[in-house]
Interface confidence: medium
């Protein structure tokens, strides 16, 4: 499928501390590494093994994993040992996705937003709770206030600045002739001065199969930079697109399977079917990357009845540019993104 075939288990059972005698030892010290690092298949990360010894090709979704043979961190995979009770020695690489969260004894579903108190707005994302403060930490009053102090005001959730003047009388606002404004005014002015910024999406973290693309945006209530992510799949790993290049041609810019399909992610299936386009490949050293694309929301339904949605890169068209670096270096494209002067057909 277009996103990934997914494991059926999503148990997050921690390994017990006792009964480790029967667990095999996968790490050997001192380290014994081959003279040269392995050559990884297209789209597979070259990483340091779990023993922190040697370079290895990261285990992929559905592969067996151990403390030494670790799952591809660039694809958001973890080693699920739940199928190897009670040894917890050999697991299966699974996608960390769609996992609920527990905060202060309260369970929240993946994707659920909530306010644990009046000061924070939180969201459960894949087992992690991310919170943004609702009380802006605005600057203290200006020079006219030598002793600013934050105090709780009855009936207000957020603390506010007050000024204690020489007579030790709290004063909430500035003298009228200073032209300064109180904390609320500063918040409003700060929002007026907030310049919205959204960075371009980074290149997909993998050259084939499921990857992640990120961007930074401050388009939010707080005007604070936050990282957004989307799933991406430039081309399937299990199709040899080279064989589809027509005789006499050097590139196939776009590959589109004939049949529509449902995306699957961590055992959950998209609620509608899609017929995605993928970027093709070249016979020479050129790379094919998206030219016209957008981000769509894909809704998934899980076997347990829960659902979630993910932002996904949707490819409309691709072009094949002139420079192609190591396809296993997922950060190479971040150095310089080709401009359209490099287009070649």
């Amino acid at each position: 499928t277009a996103l990934s075939p997914a494991p059926t288990t999503m148990d997050f059972t921690p390994a017990p501390l006792e009964d480790t005698s029967s667990r095999p030892q996968f790490c050997k010290w001192p380290c014994e590494c081959p003279p040269s690092p392995p050559r990884c298949p297209l789209g597979v990360s070259l990483i340091t093994d779990g023993c922190e010894c040697c370079k290895m090709c990261a285990q992929q979704l559905g592969d067996n994993c151990t403390e030494a043979a670790i799952c591809d961190p660039h694809r958001g995979l973890y080693c699920d040992y739940s199928g190897d009770r009670p040894r917890y020695a050999i697991g299966v690489c699974a996608q960390v996705v769609g996992v609920g969260c527990v905060l202060d004894g309260v369970r929240y579903n993946n994707g659920q937003s909530f306010q644990p108190n009046c000061k924070y707005n939180c969201t459960c994302i894949d087992g992690a709770v991310g919170c943004t403060p609702l009380c802006l930490r605005v600057r203290p009053p200006r020079l006219w206030c030598p002793h600013p102090r934050r105090v709780s005001i009855p009936g207000h959730c957020c603390e506010q600045w007050v000024c204690e003047d020489d007579a030790k009388r709290p004063r909430k606002t500035a003298p009228r002739d200073t032209g300064a404004f109180d904390a609320v005014g500063e918040v409003e002015a700060w929002h007026r001065n907030c310049i919205a910024y959204t960075s371009p999406w980074s290149p997909c973290s993998t050259s084939c199969g499921l990857g992640v693309s990120t961007r930074i945006s401050n388009v939010n209530a707080q005007c604070w930079p936050e990282q957004e992510s989307r799933l991406c799949n430039l081309r399937p790993c299990d199709v040899d697109i080279h064989t589809l290049i027509k005789a006499g041609k050097k590139c196939l810019a776009v590959y589109q399977p004939e049949a529509s399909m449902n995306f699957t992610l961590a055992g959950c299936i998209s609620t509608r079917s899609y017929q995605p386009k993928y970027c093709g490949v070249c016979m020479d050293n050129r790379c094919c990357i998206p030219y016209k694309s957008k981000t769509i929301d894909v809704s998934f339904q899980c076997p347990d009845g829960l659902g979630f949605s993910r932002q996904v890169l949707w490819i409309n068209a691709c072009f094949c540019n002139l420079s192609c670096r190591n396809p296993n270096d997922i950060f190479a494209d971040l150095e310089s993104y080709p401009d359209f002067s490099e287009i070649a057909n």
């Epitope: 371009p200 776009v254 030219y291 016209k292 957008k294 949707w314 409309n316 068209a317 057909n345």
Partner: antibody, heavy 120, light 110 residues
Framework: QMQLVQSGAEVKRPGASVKVSCKAS????????INWVRQATGQGLEWMGW????????GSAPAFQGRVTMTRDTSIGTAYMELSGLTSEDTAVYYC?????????????WGQGTLVTVSS | QSVLTQPPSASGTPGQTVTVSCSGR????????VDWYQHLPGTAPKLLIY???RRPSGVPDRFSGSKSGTSASLAISGLQSEDEADYYC???????????FGTGTKLTVL
């Protein structure tokens, strides 16, 4: 109801630039790409390029690269197409059209067209 | 010049069925869906068929589209006088990275 309303007719000198606007209403402006298509008198339809109002990303046909600039102002739901280095061959009716490329739904809404005349 | 080829003209009498052809390449019609537009003089073009054979709401079922390989066709049954217009096929071209229109067919209702 959904519609695209374009700016009025323009008369330009050769070498000058023209900027045509296209105001969208009745739908979410950032959810659909805006395309620009032109038709010279007695000629067929010619696609100039596309712009994604959400990201500002755009792409143009090779025939217009370096001459066409597509921008937008999401706060007022308006797309703009600026064509520079005008010649008499650029005399045409210019249309904006929206498409949801993700659903391959074609250009399902069009502006009324803007006549640009290039004459010395 | 256009990479989608259409006959310059077609004609028919009221009530007849007329077919307009559109010939392309593997990089456009062969690998992408085809759209059809009706263009009346002095008005904006109107989408008749999208995704090769689907009709937008409001388009009469007298209009139908089909695609086979690198060719597509538009069929208009029960021809009416108001169908007299220019008809264009169009498709995205993966090699050129452009949306290409056909050369256009002028339909005359006799």
């Amino acid at each position: 109801q959904m519609q695209l309303v374009q700016s009025g007719a323009e008369v330009k000198r050769p070498g000058a630039s023209v900027k045509v606007s296209c105001k969208a209403s009745g739908y979410s402006f950032t959810n659909f790409d805006i395309n620009w298509v032109r038709q010279a008198t007695g000629q067929g339809l010619e696609w100039m390029g596309w712009m994604d109002p959400n990201s500002g990303n755009s792409g143009s046909a090779p025939a217009f690269q370096g001459r066409v600039t597509m921008t937008r102002d999401t706060s007022i739901g308006t797309a703009y197409m600026e064509l520079s280095g005008l010649t008499s061959e650029d005399t045409a009716v210019y249309y904006c059209a929206r498409d949801d490329f993700y659903d391959s739904s074609g250009f399902d809404a069009w502006g009324q067209g803007t006549l640009v005349t290039v004459s010395s | 010049q256009s990479v989608l080829t259409q006959p310059p003209s077609a004609s028919g009498t009221p009530g007849q069925t007329v077919t307009v052809s559109c010939s392309g390449r593997s990089s456009n019609v062969g690998s992408n869906t085809v759209d059809w537009y009706q263009h009346l003089p002095g008005t904006a073009p109107k989408l008749l068929i999208y995704s090769s054979n689907r009709r937008p709401s409001g388009v009469p079922d007298r209009f139908s589209g089909s695609k086979s390989g690198t060719s597509a066709s538009l069929a208009i049954s029960g021809l009416q006088s108001e169908d007299e217009a220019d008809y264009y096929c169009a498709a995205w071209d993966d090699s050129l990275n452009v949306y290409v229109f056909g050369t256009g067919t002028k339909l005359t209702v006799l």
